[in-house]
Structure formats: C-alpha cells, structure tokens
C-alpha cells in the first residue's frame, strides 16, 4: 500500500530548491530522479538545465508518481542539473537534482614504506596504503596479512579531499609487538565497482639488531 498525503502548498515530497540533491549515476544503469509527489494527479515536467526537457516515453524514461522519473538506461546526456517542475494553483514549484558521474577509476595505489620491511621482534608495524582516485570516485580498501585469522591488525581509514582534482584515501594498518608468525606478505587491495588494484610488501622479522 502506498498512501499519498495531498498538500497543495507542497507538491513534492522532498523539496531541494536551496541546494540540489546530488545523485550519483553510472552510464548504462537505471537512474531515478526521485521527485515523487504528494498527489498522483500532479503533472510534473523534467528539465535539464538550461535548455532541454526530458519527455517520458514510457520506455527509457518513465514517470512514476510514487518514485519520480525512472531513466532505465542513463547516458552522459543526463549528467547535469535536472529540475522537476510542477504548477499547482498557478504557482510554479521546483526541486533540483545534480547528477554526478560515478567513476570507478583508481589512479594509483601505494604502500608508503620501504620494501621489503625489516623489523625487530616486539616492535610495532605501521603500513600506510594510499589510493588516489578522481573526485567522483569511492573505494573499498582491505588488507590481507599472515596472521589475519587472529585479527592481529588494527586499521584506520581517512580521506583527504583538499586536493581540487583528486581524492586520496588512506588505510593505515598497525600491528603491535610483532612476532615471527607476523612475517610474510602484506597486501592492500583497493576496489571501486569493477575496478581493482592491489599492492604488496614483504615483512621480515629479526631477533637481534643486526638488520
């Protein structure tokens, strides 16, 4: 059951007039412009700033009063500022959405420590994995390491968005009181949608200070 709660002063359930709502889109996938309405008989027009009107054809672009405009196979043509417009009692209402291309590009992945890593037993291991991506990309970063089953490592993550042309993701792996069982291959894996990159380093453990 879907219940409409009619409100003549508010034709859209969510109104984004101050700042557009960001919608991440991927070419070839379904894109929903979620300007659902408070009454099923409200007529809504979808405009692409500044010159175009997107006409629902019942196939590629469908209007559903409970969801909004459904674009079954989004293309680059739908990237930009999209506005849903409705006129109620002579008053024009607008709600705005900014579609943003979701990319899956991973520019670079690095472990910022010398290779191989040489460490004294009992000392702390810190490995910093850095992934660089375009601005409109998100990633998942995971580690695999020798004593993973005992969850020996703690992992901290952060993102640096101060660069105006790229996102830099950090994943810092820390293991206290390194033992012989912790020696071996440490791999940082970075995934963004179908894209995947990994980088690894070998960690050697020594008993005495003759490294």
């Amino acid at each position: 059951i879907y219940i409409f709660i009619s409100d003549t002063g508010r034709p859209f359930v969510e109104m984004y007039s101050e700042i557009p709502e960001i919608i991440h889109m991927t070419e070839g996938r379904e894109l929903v412009i979620p300007c659902r309405v408070t009454s099923p008989n409200i007529t809504v027009t979808l405009k692409k700033f500044p010159l175009d009107t997107l006409i629902p054809d019942g196939k590629r672009i469908i209007w559903d009063s409970r969801k909004g405009f459904i674009i079954s196979n989004a293309t680059y043509k739908e990237i930009g500022l999209l506005t849903c417009e409705a006129t109620v009692n002579g008053h024009l209402y607008k709600t705005n959405y900014l579609t943003h291309r979701q990319t899956n590009t991973i520019i670079d992945v690095q472990i910022s420590t010398p290779r191989p890593v040489k460490l004294l037993r009992g000392h702390t291991l810190v490995l910093n994995c850095t992934a660089t991506t375009p601005l409109n990309t998100r990633v998942q970063m995971t580690w695999s390491y020798p004593d993973e089953k005992n969850k020996r490592a703690s992992v901290r993550r952060r993102i640096d968005q101060s660069n105006s042309h790229a996102n830099i993701f950090y994943s810092v792996l820390t293991i206290d009181k390194m033992q012989n069982k912790d020696k071996g291959l440490y791999t940082c894996r970075v995934r963004s949608g179908p894209s995947f990159k990994s980088v690894n380093t070998s960690v050697h453990i020594y008993d005495k200070a003759f490294i």
Partner: antibody
Framework: EVQLLESGGGLVQPGGSLRLSCEAS????????MNWVRQAPGKGLEWVSI????????AYSDSVKGRFTISRDNSKNSLYLQMNSLRAEDTAIYYC?????????WGQGTTVTVSS | QSVLTQPPSASGTPGQRVTISCSGG????????VSWYQQLPGTAPKLLIY???QRPSGVPDRFSGSKSGTSASLAISGLQSEDEADYYC???????????FGGGTKLTVL
C-alpha cells in the same frame, strides 16, 4: 587538472569571419555544457553562447544571434565558435568556459580584433 | 546595459567586511541559482560562489554568498589586499534563455 586552451583569434576586417577553437583536457568533456563568454577591452563580462553536453541544444545572446554558431566535437574534446559578419563591437577576449556548478573553469582566452 | 545591476565600485580597508549587491528580476535571480566570479587584474575570471552560497574547494571562507527574492549579495570579511579585483554576479534567465551578468564591481582595498 582541467585545462581549456582557446585558439583562432586575430585581427580581422569588419564583415570578415573567424573560427575560434577550444581544446579541453583533464575532464570528461562530453559530460559538460560549454559556454563562450567575451570581454571587450576595459568592459565587463558578456555571455555569448552555450551548447549542451550532447550538442543537441544551443542558445545565443541577442548581440550575436544569426552571426555566430557554436558547435562541439566530443570525440576531439573540442568546442568551436564560428563568427561571421564581424563588427567592431565584437572586439574582445573570448573565453571558453566549462559549465556545471556554475561557470566552473575558464580558459585564458583568445583575442579577437575587428578593425579596418 | 547589464540585466543584473551591481554597484560599479566598492572599497574597504584590510580586515574590514565589504558587501557587493546584485539585483535582477523574477526570471533570472528570482527563479535560478546565482554564481559569483572574481577577476584579478590581467587574468581570466574564476568561480567564487555557486548555487547562491556554495564555495568551490580552495575558495577561502571569508567569501560568502546569499540570495533573497530577486537580489543576491557577496560578502567578503577580513578584507585582504589580494582581494582587489573585479567581481561579477551571473544567473540564467528563463524567459529569454540566456546567461546574464552584472556589470561588475571593482573592489579597491585602501
């Protein structure tokens, strides 16, 4: 890094023609609407024309309508402005501009001088 | 004559707060987003404010924008000598399908 490099400006006689080009790099060119904006010597900014990202729609200021034509070639990451029937008042620096949040990124401009 | 109206000049001393106004109509500022541009002497314009009050990354928070009805304004607090530039407002005009600019405001830091 977004880069917009205009070319094609120069000195032309009244009634003559010029074709400006803008080569774009550092972003997915076909995703964005593009503008041409001009600035006459010592004057303010004047919008000239816009083209939508797929090239299907265009608009022009009244001062250039019927004389200028904006176009783009997404396969070449290039924007163009064909200027015909040039007048002295078209003398300006012409900027190629990427449009998304606003007029986000500007080229350094190319100078057009219309004089006999 | 520009469709959007700005004062031709404004001035202030370092550290002061200065406001530049931009007045338009129902078909431009009244129904669309306003953006502001800074043009330093001899350089291309740069986006300073978009969507009425949003700042691009890299623009100091000393710059702020606002909009009310058919008018908008740009405020610069903690004025610095490097803020000396020309400032332009702009908006799309629905009625005639054109971008409209203000005439520009020359800001002088005394």
């Amino acid at each position: 890094e977004v880069q917009l490099l205009e070319s094609g400006g120069g000195l032309v006689q009244p009634g003559g023609s010029l074709r400006l080009s803008c080569e774009a790099s550092g972003f997915i060119f076909r995703d964005y609407n593009m503008n041409w904006v001009r600035q006459a010597p010592g004057k303010g900014l004047e919008w000239v024309s816009i083209i939508t990202n797929d090239g299907s729609s265009t608009a022009y200021s009244d001062s250039v309508k019927g004389r200028f034509t904006i176009s783009r070639d997404n396969s070449k990451n290039s924007l163009y402005l064909q200027m015909n029937s040039l007048r002295a008042e078209d003398t300006a620096i012409y900027y190629c501009v990427k449009v998304y949040y606003g007029m986000d990124d500007w080229g350094q401009g190319t100078t057009v001088t219309v004089s006999s | 004559q520009s469709v959007l109206t700005q004062p031709p000049s404004a001035s202030g001393t370092p550290g002061q707060r200065v406001t530049i106004s931009c007045s338009g109509g129902s078909s431009n500022i009244g129904s669309n987003y306003v953006s502001w541009y800074q043009q330093l002497p001899g350089t291309a314009p740069k986006l300073l404010i978009y969507f009425n009050f949003q700042r691009p990354s890299g623009v100091p928070d000393r710059f702020s924008g606002s909009k009310s009805g058919t008018s908008a304004s740009l405020a610069i607090s903690g004025l610095q000598s490097e803020d000396e530039a020309d400032y332009y407002c702009a908006a799309w005009d629905d009625r005639v399908n054109v971008w409209v600019f203000g005439g520009g405001t020359k800001l002088t830091v005394l």
